[in-house]
């Protein structure tokens, strides 16, 4: 999929497909970027899943394990965002893979990602009306990290 | 800044500004969108050593500490990407914050991010020629995570 933009263009404008811009047979989804909602993440700690596996994906082998939760909004680009939910309040012991070590905190790593929301353009009507994409910052939790607790000065 | 897209469009196409699309006073150019790293960059490079700090940003307090490395490409959207570089091969002990624990590996968490590369459009010439933005997946390391070593079956 190629996007065309004119040099010095102010913004991506109305969509005007031409004959040479044939849609590919299968769409590459924009929706695979991993980001999460702006509201604070609730730490629902499931004791049964608070363990570090010795196999499987990185998020389950981490001593600060996390799961990914889908956040879908059909009027947003990307539509599908995934945010990391920490499964333990503390880090899991490297020795056992199950017992928690109070010396370490399992905390989410946040990032403000740019997303776009589709809104009807001001004054536009009819079935083929154009939509405006509003730029927003969206708070992302990318992963959970094992950190030493912060010592206040 | 608003982006306009017509309903039912196959992909974001040529940029064709029209009279009703008055340019805003200040453009947020796609090409200059600067994505900052998830944690503030510390300009005092204490984080460059293999130790877990008790204060500072999350990437220096982690027991799998990392630094951010700028990857800039003026013909890419976004121009600036940050890669996490692990500062230790193993996780740092929660007790000391400095000695490494061979029971844990410090590994990068990778993500395939969608980026766009600017290319001159086929057959376009002249000073106001249009550019195509080619969609690509770009491998980025988001952070470093402390994991239990994988046990082979």
């Amino acid at each position: 999929v190629s996007l065309r933009i004119q040099e010095g263009c102010s913004h991506l404008p109305s969509c005007c497909p031409s004959k040479e811009q044939e849609p590919p047979e299968e769409w590459l989804k924009w929706s695979s970027a991993s980001v999460s909602p702006p509201e604070p993440l609730s730490h629902t700690h499931h004791a049964e899943s608070c363990r570090a596996s010795k196999d499987g994906p990185l998020n389950s082998r981490a001593i600060s394990p996390w799961s990914y939760e889908l956040d879908r909004d059909l009027n947003r680009v990307p539509q599908d965002l995934y945010h990391a939910r920490c499964l333990c309040p503390h880090c899991v012991s490297l020795q056992t893979g199950s017992h928690m070590d109070p010396l370490g905190n399992s905390v989410p790593l946040y990032h403000n990602q740019t997303v776009f929301y589709r809104r009807p353009c001001h004054g536009e009507e009819g079935t083929h009306r154009r939509y405006c994409l509003e730029r927003r910052l969206y708070r992302v939790s990318l992963a959970c990290v094992c950190v030493r607790p912060r010592v206040m000065a | 800044v608003s982006l306009r897209i017509q309903e039912g469009c196959s992909h974001l196409p040529s940029c064709c500004p029209s009279k009703e699309q008055e340019p805003p006073e200040e453009w947020l150019k796609w090409s200059s969108a600067s994505v900052s790293p998830p944690e503030p960059l510390s300009h005092t490079h204490h984080a460059e050593s293999c130790r877990a700090s008790k204060d500072g940003p999350l990437n220096s307090r982690a027991i799998s500490p990392w630094s951010y490395e700028l990857d800039r490409d003026l013909n890419r959207v976004p121009q600036d990407l940050y890669h996490a570089r692990c500062l230790c091969p193993h996780c740092v002990s929660l007790q000391t914050g400095s000695h490494m624990d061979p029971l844990g590996n410090s590994v990068p968490l990778y993500h395939n991010q969608t980026v766009f590369y600017r290319r001159p459009c086929h057959g376009e010439e002249g000073t106001h020629r249009r550019y195509c933005l080619e969609r690509r997946l770009y491998r980025v390391s988001l952070a470093c995570v402390c994991v239990r070593p994988r046990v082979m079956a």
């Epitope: 990914y68 059909l74 680009v77 599908d80 | 039912g8």
Partner: antibody, heavy 125, light 107 residues
Framework: QVQLVQSGAEVKKPGASVKVSCKAS????????MNWVRQAPGQGLEWMGL????????SYKQKFQGRVTMTVDKSISTAYMELSRLRSDDTAVYYC??????????????????WGQGTLVTVSS | DIQMTQSPSSLSASVGDRVTITCQAS??????LNWYQQKPGKAPKLLIY???TLHTGVPSRFSGSGSGTDYTFTISSLQPEDIATYYC?????????FGQGTKLEIK
């Protein structure tokens, strides 16, 4: 052709757990989300949740949160749905259903376009 | 959660009849609506997505329309093989929800 083949019928006691499998073939397993839907005898369809096989990302219906676990094994293109603390009203046919995405990027439409044959789970003491 | 109310819950019609089923959402679902057919003892089958788009291989006698909260599913000329239960499903917001179903019988 796309096929979803589910594990056989199960009879469970109240309080037990059940794990239903769904083996996919004929398409790229990690490229499509998998939904789980159940249907109690003589009743309608009830959506339970979904999982993205690529990253293990899930979304569960609140009603099942804490009791359902959806997982995948990418190496054998299989999705699993485990339901714990079973009750008699969990007696139902459980379906896996692939979620197809349609229409122009970046605004897709989603629909459950291929379904497994269903797995009857009976919960009885 | 978005509630989906289907009506009627059952209906009888003759071969060749025009059959209409309605589905009402508890809030605006912006045409994000699918329709499924389920025959006795079988898994559901996708017929229509995004209110009115026919899925591959679905006969043209099936159609859908509507907007906002009110949607309609129509069979222009009922065939014996159309005997089944029909469900609407919204995908506007997670969790997905289905209507309670409409059982279609031949007179």
């Amino acid at each position: 052709q796309v096929q979803l083949v589910q594990s056989g019928a199960e009879v469970k006691k109240p309080g037990a757990s059940v794990k239903v499998s769904c083996k996919a073939s004929g398409y790229s397993f990690t490229g499509y989300t998998m939904n789980w839907v159940r249907q109690a005898p003589g009743q309608g369809l009830e959506w339970m949740g979904l999982i993205n096989p690529d990253n293990g990302g899930t979304s569960y219906k609140q009603k099942f949160q804490g009791r359902v676990t959806m997982t995948v094994d990418k190496s054998i293109s299989t999705a699993y749905m485990e339901l714990s603390r079973l009750r008699s009203d969990d007696t139902a046919v459980y379906y896996c259903a692939r979620e197809g995405y349609y229409g122009p990027s970046p605004f897709h439409h989603y629909a459950m376009d291929y379904w497994g044959q269903g797995t009857l789970v009976t919960v009885s003491s | 959660d978005i509630q989906m109310t289907q009506s009627p819950s059952s209906l009888s019609a003759s071969v060749g009849d025009r059959v209409t089923i309605t589905c009402q959402a508890s809030q605006d679902i912006s045409n994000y609506l699918n329709w499924y057919q389920q025959k006795p003892g079988k898994a559901p089958k996708l017929l229509i997505y995004y209110t009115s788009t026919l899925h591959t291989g679905v006969p043209s006698r099936f159609s859908g329309s509507g907007s906002g909260t009110d949607y309609t599913f129509t069979i222009s000329s009922l065939q014996p093989e159309d005997i089944a239960t029909y469900y609407c499903q919204q995908y506007s917001k997670l969790p997905y929800t289905f209507g309670q179903g409409t059982k279609l019988e031949i007179k």
